[in-house]
């Protein structure tokens, strides 16, 4: 995409502290790589609301991201 | 409490130059996606430019490329689009938008601001 440059996390800022559970069609962990040294959380919103970032060190991303490894380990 | 609110906006030659801003109020920019969004009479909104405080990187549509500089100031909480070059096609209600957890992908999409300025009036004429 060409708003992209190597080296940039894909969130701007930290992220929000939830979304409404209802709203969320899917979740995705993007883990530190070259690109971003921090784990970023984010929402795929259903009905074709595009994406949102959850702030990592929130409680809901932590849920998220226990499930998301719980079910990939 | 968030509050957006813009200024300078007015009516100016084609060619002219005008400089708008959004004072931030309730927030910190470092922690939002600031966008300007236009929208003409009988168009939908469309996103102009965004600016990320945090560290420094500016989007644009197509359209403003090489005319319009968006930029901020932490210390005074508010961000400035200057306009070069106008021209009658740029006619239209500027906003100003605050956005948090805004993906760089989706920063010129108004589905991704929570919060939203009043508007600013720019009319180009020939």
């Known amino acids: 995409f060409p708003m992209f440059k190597r080296g940039r996390c894909l969130c701007i800022g930290p992220g929000v502290k939830a979304v409404k559970v209802a709203d969320i069609e899917k979740a995705s962990i993007m883990y530190p790589s070259n690109n971003c040294d921090k784990i970023e959380v984010i929402i795929t919103l259903k009905e074709n609301k595009g994406q949102r970032c959850l702030n990592p060190k929130s409680k809901q991303a932590r849920l998220i991201i226990k499930k998301v490894e719980r079910k990939n380990f | 409490e968030v509050q957006l609110v813009e200024s300078g906006g007015g009516l100016v030659q084609a060619g002219g130059s005008l400089r708008l801003s959004c004072a931030a109020s309730?927030?910190?920019?470092?922690?939002?996606?600031i966008g300007w969004f236009r929208q003409a009479p009988g168009k939908e909104r469309e996103g102009v430019s965004c600016?990320?405080?945090?560290?420094?990187?500016?989007y644009y549509a197509d359209s403003v490329k090489g005319r319009f500089t968006i930029s901020s100031d932490n210390a005074k909480n508010t961000v400035y689009l200057q306009m070069n070059s106008l021209k009658p096609e740029d006619t239209a209600v500027y906003y100003c938008?605050?956005?948090?957890?805004?993906?760089?992908?989706?920063?010129?999409?108004?589905?991704?601001?929570?919060?939203w300025g009043q508007g600013t009036q720019v009319t180009v004429s020939s």
């Open positions: 938008a605050a956005g948090q957890g805004v993906l760089r992908l989706w920063v010129l999409s108004s589905s991704s601001y929570d919060y």
């Open positions: 309730g927030f910190t920019l470092d922690d939002y996606a």
């Open positions: 600016i990320s405080s945090s560290d420094g990187s500016t």
